[in-house]
């Protein structure tokens, strides 16, 4: 069941230079049909079968994880980096993403989120919490997961196009999805809309322009008239169960 999925290492990665040109910049085709070129994948892990998951940045890890070298607290130190369990209250940290949901990094210590701690423009950093298109959710609020008091109580919900950290930051009918260098609120997909079918578990995503998941009662499936097409060009749309 969905509830047994305890850790989601969401492999939404950046386009590597060979595909995307210098520095991972997409071609102009992304502007025309965002997301169509890039298929992503998710890695689901249960606590009784936990495998270290390689990563380049926090965004590729689950909501209760951050990206770092196993022997060091901060990412980017060199060597292989993997998704590590987030740090609980009063543990040392270097950035918000290292702290578990509901906490943020203040003066090197994970502290409980309290809106009064944040000056204007300050942010509680996290990662995308989209488990993918095969799990359907109530529009706008994703899947069973921890949410923070900060997200739920202290600030207004973001409209489409606003910066977000998680889907609970966004208004009803929207989810928080990757948008090039940032994450913004985007519409949950409706019936008939093109969706991204995440392939096998553990495959690395290449979405720099991420779509939301399909809305309630919908699943991301191959469009019927595209069955004959080659695997690489199959079009997926949100369809009724």
């Amino acid at each position: 069941t969905l509830n047994s999925v305890l850790i989601n290492s969401n492999a939404i990665k950046n386009l590597p230079p060979p595909l995307g040109g210098a520095g991972g910049q997409p071609g102009s085709a992304v502007s025309v049909a965002p997301g169509v070129l890039y298929e992503g994948g998710n890695k689901y892990q249960t606590l009784d079968n936990y495998q270290p998951y390689p990563c380049a940045e926090d965004e590729e890890c689950g909501s209760d994880e951050y990206c770092s070298s196993p022997s060091r607290g901060a990412a980017g130190v060199g060597g292989v980096q993997i998704c590590l369990a987030c740090r609980k209250r009063r543990k040392r940290c270097m950035r918000h993403a290292m702290c578990c949901p509901g906490n943020y990094c203040k003066n090197g210590i994970c502290m409980p989120s309290d809106h009064s701690h944040f000056p204007r423009g300050e942010i509680e950093e996290s990662i995308i919490e989209n488990l993918g298109n095969d799990h359907n959710a109530a529009a706008g609020d994703g899947y069973p997961r921890r949410t923070t008091l900060t997200s739920k109580i202290y600030h207004t919900k973001g409209q489409e196009g606003s910066v977000c950290l998680r889907s609970s930051d966004c208004a009803a009918g929207l989810c928080c999805a990757r948008h090039f260098w940032s994450k913004i609120c985007k519409p949950v997909l409706k019936e008939g809309q093109v969706c991204t079918k995440h392939k096998r578990k553990g495959s690395h995503g290449l979405e720099i322009f991420q779509r939301c998941y399909c809305g309630e009662g919908l699943a991301c499936r191959i469009q019927k008239d595209h069955h004959q097409a080659s695997n690489s060009s199959r079009l997926h749309t949100c369809q009724r169960h």
């Epitope: 950046n14 386009l15 520095g23 991972g24 910049q25 997409p26 102009s28 992304v30 502007s31 025309v32 965002p34 380049a56 940045e57 926090d58 965004e59 990206c67 990412a75 980017g76 270097m94 950035r95 918000h96 993403a97 990094c105 809106h115 944040f118 000056p119 204007r120 423009g121 300050e122 942010i123 509680e124 950093e125 900060t150 997200s151 202290y154 600030h155 207004t156 919900k157 973001g158 409209q159 489409e160 196009g161 606003s162 910066v163 977000c164 950290l165 930051d169 948008h179 090039f180 260098w181 940032s182 913004i184 609120c185 720099i208």
Partner: antibody
Framework: QVQLVESGGGLVQPGGSLRLSCAAS????????LHWVRQAPGKGLEWVSS????????YYADSVKGRFTISRDNSKNTLYLQMNSLRAEDTAVYYC?????????????????WGQGTLVTVSS | DIQMTQSPSSLSASVGDRVTITCRAS??????LNWYQQKPGKAPKLLIG???SLQSGVPSRFSGSGSGTDFTLTISSLQPEDFATYYC?????????FGQGTKVEIK
């Protein structure tokens, strides 16, 4: 108080190099996407480059690709723009910009906060 | 690239006037558009995000509307401090692109 202060501008000859810095304060630097935007004298704004919050993804305008490199040092709260093979058309004020936050009221947007800029003049 | 065409390029108006600036995208950009104000020698200031969201500290005489390809920035009653250049920015596609600017001058 969010503050972005650019430095490193100056006069350089065509073909030369320059490294711009943007020192940030008043916020947790490592949590934000950052950008360089330039403005030639008397002209409009032109996006130059962006970098994701942890620095893994970088993006460049076609006009600077292969010549400019954006980077960040989260331990120093500083954003950089290494500019090589400079041309006369690179002459501009270079601004550092930062995205907003979901905790802004209302929730923030991209390119929300800007520094005051540093002038780069490429001339022989 | 997505082209942003701003009009007019300049306008003369008096204090108290209602001023409208438009921005047209070469393709649909949903509501992924910001409006900025820039005064001479100063950095741009974000006025409106996502086409219509007034930013904190920005006077309510500024408003934004539109979606898709056509967008409008309206100043309901022009004040002396509003004389400046205004830019739109689309962030729907890469690269992000600005309009060429609209200079609002005193009549």
């Amino acid at each position: 108080q969010v503050q972005l202060v650019e430095s490193g501008g100056g006069l350089v000859q065509p073909g030369g190099s320059l490294r711009l810095s943007c020192a940030a304060s008043g916020f947790t630097f490592s949590n934000y996407g950052l950008h360089w935007v330039r403005q030639a004298p008397g002209k409009g704004l032109e996006w130059v480059s962006s970098i994701s919050y942890y620095g893994s993804s970088t993006y460049y305008a076609d006009s600077v690709k292969g010549r400019f490199t954006i980077s960040r040092d989260n331990s120093k709260n500083t954003l950089y723009l290494q500019m090589n093979s400079l041309r006369a058309e690179d002459t501009a004020v270079y601004y550092c910009a930062r995205d907003g936050s979901h905790m802004d009221k209302p929730p923030g947007y991209v390119f929300a906060f800007w520094g005051q800029g540093t002038l780069v003049t490429v001339s022989s | 690239d997505i082209q942003m065409t701003q009009s007019p390029s300049s306008l003369s108006a008096s204090v108290g006037d209602r001023v409208t600036i438009t921005c047209r995208a070469s393709q649909g950009i949903k509501n992924y558009l910001n409006w900025y104000q820039q005064k001479p020698g100063k950095a741009p200031k974000l006025l409106i995000g996502a086409a219509s969201s007034l930013q904190s500290g920005v006077p309510s005489r500024f408003s934004g509307s539109g979606s898709g390809t056509d967008f409008t920035l309206t100043i309901s009653s022009l004040q002396p401090e509003d004389f400046a250049t205004y830019y739109c920015l689309q962030y729907y596609g890469m690269p992000p692109t600005f309009g060429q600017g609209t200079k609002v001058e005193i009549k």
